[in-house]
Amino acid sequence: QTDMSRKAFVFPKESDTSYVSLKAPLTKPLKAFTVCLHFYTELSSTRGYSIFSYATKRQDNEILIFWSKDIGYSFTVGGSEILFEVPEVTVAPVHICTSWESASGIVEFWVDGKPRVRKSLKKGYTVGAEASIILGQEQDSFGGNFEGSQSLVGDIGNVNMWDFVLSPDEINTIYLGGPFSPNVLNWRALKYEVQGEVFTKPQLWP
């Protein structure tokens, strides 16, 4: 376990071999989750890229947060996708939080502390627990089958995950840098493995 506070993973160039694998202590399927993270890239007006890829052996797109060029954020649960459009692209560090719950199918997507309109996805579904969680690449099969054209070039950090839906107040607290206790992925006690050319550097966002 490593305390990654104030640090970020840096992916300096496009590749299909560089990634970070995150280890999560999940023992049972997820009926809800929240993922929050920071990232910083210049790619957004150039091509799509993977932000957070959670694959199981049953479904390689179990949870996927992806930037789709000319559209915005693509959010997939259990292979089914919804979009959160972004009309104008700026180059700046971005903080995102996204949550989903099985009971209602409701998805929330927050960008820099501001909520997008709620949408619905995969009501009644459960997310598999035996997962390969990858930063920097999009998994087309469990733990692999990467494409360089979908890789992240830039920084990513503050990756935290909960097995429940955070309240708006809690998400606001996280965005403002307040205290929180994630129970699936914890950036301050992170189990991870680096493959390829990935560096750990001080974070560039506040």
Epitope: G48, N61, S68, S74, S80, E81, L121, K122
Partner: nanobody, 117 residues
Amino acid sequence: EVQLQQSGPEVLKPGTSVRMSCKASGYTFTDYNIHWVKQSRGESLEWIGFVNPDTGDTYYYKNFKGKATLTFNRSSSTAYMDLRSLTSEDSAVYYCARGTTVEKDYWGQGTILTVSS
């Protein structure tokens, strides 16, 4: 076995409309989005949009807003695309595909549309 079976070729006059279909089988229809893609002769693929048969959400890429309308019928596991005010520019092969904007794993065989006076 997953299959996407598309409707047959169409020859139509400018100014008319067309509906093409894409019948899914071999999986639960509501589990995956259905995308529509245009391939004009000698051109690269153009993404038209997609429909989520679970939620009913549709998304249209910029060039096809107002040109295409995407619908579906859950009971028959069929997705439809209507194209209106046809011109010769709409002559192309149109494909449906299962998946996401990131990856599409199964494709229909294509529907050839010819618009000619």
